[in-house]
């Protein structure tokens, strides 16, 4: 059936355009030939002018931006809210792990507490920073914890007769800690567990944040002039003929959108791989690859490592006595 | 063996959970996230259709606009005519992605590689190096309680897992609310309604 004749006075077009662009000077009073139009090429008289066409193109591109954001809204909310939940949850886990470790020191080794609390605090601060992407080496964090703890254990528990420890003997004891493997294989064990679980946690958060970045990138794409013209033709050219209530055909919309989104659709392959790789990572996040599991049990392994030192206390005291004799003599003078 | 900090576990402030009947752990929440994400696995390939489903298109109307004229919704002209003599769609597609899209693709490639190298091969959850250190002794490995490795009588079972972190103390789990069926199913069906 032929389209209804355009509005003889362009009145409807005028009142619609008024909403887009207050000030009516661009709308013809009555239909005109429209020979200067570049997008809404008329088959007969038209109620559009070149200026109106330009305004329609601008509106179409803004409209497209909001539609893109609407289409990705649910996905974006999903990832952002989960990234927020997990980041906060990981911080809570770290806080609890610190509390558990401090409680273990308080209840089992009260003589170590003031200094132990400080070292434990520093260690877990580093853990938090690492998860959030800080450039810290996990092995160094664990070494620092045990290097700091050993002088306190030695001077408070194994050799309490020593005067307040001085930097000299502390340095020697820190060195002896590694050379003599005073904590056995526990530091290595903790390094392995903590580094594996934290690496996975960190990459998990990084991946979620990148997911948000991907959606933001496509949400704020600037569309080409060609795309702007196609959108204008689809959404607004019907108005030039006075067809205000008619909507674009669905199949036509899909063709236009495929044209406009051609570049974006190239993300598809990598997006699929992203979700499947993330799934694989998540499936492996248990036992030593689960930071919650590892960190909340750390107090126990640290406790066992101190017990190990105590068991070998006699031997160690003798060896260290010789090894750090020079420092001790200077200290006693 | 270690003094076990029970007092911390039962601290009401720390471990209260919003909905006891649906206790949630971090691992269950991670799995739930992946399930939801998988319903968006076709997101980018289906994006043109999603956008059409968000924009006004003729759904119940008999007539629709094809870029040039008013046509019947199911006629051959409904998709075709509007593109004719206007812009070369093939050329538009040939231009390739713009720089920001290429950049984000590079970032995705990089994270995908990282994710793959970090993923644990099935059946390899405990490294050989850890096996040798006596980590797998004892009966630790059921779903509810996990062992934290330490040798000898220091083996401790940690209550699995902060029962999802009550400091986020409200229920985040409404994915089954009626009507919230994800993009994948919902919109894919809807956007087919007006194909020519």
């Amino acid at each position: 059936q032929p389209p209804p004749p355009p509005d003889a006075t362009c009145h409807q077009v005028r009142s619609f355009f008024q909403r887009l662009q207050p000030g009516l000077k661009w709308v013809p009073e009555t239909p005109v030939p429209g020979s200067d139009l570049q997008v809404c090429l008329p088959k007969g008289p038209t109620c559009c002018s070149r200026k109106m066409e330009e305004k329609y193109q601008l509106t179409a591109r803004l409209n497209m931006e909001q539609l893109l954001q609407s289409a990705s809204m649910e996905l974006k909310f999903l990832i952002i809210q989960n990234a927020a939940v997990f980041q906060e949850a990981f911080e809570i886990v770290v806080r609890h792990a610190k509390n558990y470790t401090n409680a273990m020191f308080k209840n089992n080794y009260p003589s170590l507490t003031p200094q132990a609390f400080e070292f434990v605090g520093e260690f877990f601060t580093d853990v938090s920073l690492y998860i959030l992407g800080s450039d810290i080496n996990v092995d160094d964090m664990v070494n620092e914890l045990f290097d700091s703890l050993f002088p306190v254990i030695y001077t408070q528990m194994m050799n309490p007769g020593l005067p307040e420890s001085v930097l000299d003997i502390n340095e020697c004891l820190r060195g002896a800690r590694r050379d003599l493997k005073v904590f056995g294989s526990f530091p290595k064990l903790i390094m392995t567990q903590v580094s594996k679980s934290l690496q996975v946690t960190r990459i998990f958060l990084q991946a979620l944040n990148l997911g948000i970045e991907v959606i933001n990138t496509t949400d704020h794409l600037k569309f080409s002039k060609d795309c702007g013209r196609m959108l204008t033709r689809m959404w607004y050219c019907s108005y030039c003929q006075g067809l205000m209530m008619v909507k674009p055909c669905g199949g036509y919309c899909n063709v236009v959108m495929q044209g406009c989104m051609a570049g974006v659709v190239e993300i598809d392959k990598y997006w699929r791989e992203y979700i499947l790789s993330l799934e694989e990572l998540v499936n492996g996040m248990y036992r030593i690859y689960d930071m919650e599991n590892v960190l909340l049990g750390l107090f126990s392994t640290i406790h066992d490592s101190i017990q190990y030192v105590q068991k070998n206390g006699g031997k160690l005291t003798t060896t260290i006595g010789k090894l750090c004799a020079h420092s001790q003599q200077r200290q006693y003078r | 063996s270690a003094y076990y900090p029970e007092d911390l576990f039962i601290d009401k402030k720390i471990l209260k959970v919003a909905h006891v009947e649906h206790e949630e752990t971090l691992s269950s929440r991670r799995r739930e996230l992946i399930q939801k994400l998988k319903s968006f696995i076709n997101f980018y390939s289906a994006l043109p259709g999603y956008i059409c489903s968000h924009s006004p298109v003729a759904e119940n109307d008999t007539l629709c606009w094809n870029g040039q004229e008013l046509v019947e919704r199911y006629s051959q002209k409904a998709a075709r005519n509007g593109m004719k003599n206007q812009f070369n769609l093939h050329e538009l597609k040939m231009k390739g992605p713009e720089p920001v899209v290429s950049q984000i693709i590079d970032k995705l490639k990089h994270i995908n590689q990282l994710l793959r190298t970090m993923s644990v091969p099935k059946g390899k959850v405990l490294d050989k190096s850890l096996d040798e250190e006596g980590l797998e002794s004892g009966d630790c490995g059921d779903d509810e309680d996990e062992c934290i490795g330490s040798s000898g009588d220091g083996m401790v079972k940690v209550k699995n897992q902060l029962r999802f972190l009550a400091e986020l103390a409200y229920d985040l789990d409404v994915d089954d609310a009626p009507g919230n069926k994800q993009h994948g199913n919902q919109k894919d069906n809807e956007i087919t309604t007006s194909h020519s």
């Epitope: 909310f77 990234a83 948000i212 | 409200y170």
Partner: antibody, heavy 120, light 107 residues
Framework: EVQLQQSGPELVKPGPSLKISCKAS????????MTWVKQSHGKNLEWIGL????????TYNQKFKGKATLTVDKSSSTAYMELLSLTSEDSAVYYC?????????????WGQGTSVTVSS | DIVMTQSQKFMSTSVGDRVSITCKAS??????VAWYQQKPGQSPKALIY???NRHTGVPDRFTGSGSGTDFTLTISNVQSEDLADYFC?????????FGGGTKLEIK
Amino acid sequence: EVQLQQSGPELVKPGPSLKISCKASGYSFTVSPMTWVKQSHGKNLEWIGLIHPYNGDTTYNQKFKGKATLTVDKSSSTAYMELLSLTSEDSAVYYCARWGNYYPYAMDYWGQGTSVTVSS
Amino acid sequence: DIVMTQSQKFMSTSVGDRVSITCKASQNVRSTVAWYQQKPGQSPKALIYLTSNRHTGVPDRFTGSGSGTDFTLTISNVQSEDLADYFCLQHWNYPYTFGGGTKLEIK
């Protein structure tokens, strides 16, 4: 209990800008987006935009782009809206409202509103 | 933008009656419609989300229905405290848009 406490009423002259605040408590601030709504003439409600406190990501109603700027301060669990180039048209009650715990919940808790009167 | 039209600006009803407030969307918004109640001098309060789900603490005399473009909020057994403005909201598309509101008056 979820609460959103907004700053008090404002009587301002036409001019550069005004910042109103919305302090959230009783829930995890970073997890839920915060939306802002304008109510003029005691009836008409308009959605201004939303912000994700987790990363400061914003989405605006095109109508309010350049008129409103949304920000958050995570450390104090506070959301802010700055209104720019104030005119009498901006006189209204402005509400902050939490977007529910997960995508489909819409705005589930609202602040008490901040009345803004712009008059010379 | 999607226009949400609440054609009845005012509705008058008696305590114990059943009343239906309608909202029409200018395009298909699937089920992403919420309803809000605003009592005089107060901020809006969430009643219904996703067309038909009651928010916590909302009495079961409030029910929502509809899909696509036509939505209804029904209050059965109206109480005097239900005197308020009722607004619908769509969140299918940005910008989210509200209906103009329906004032419920109790005879």
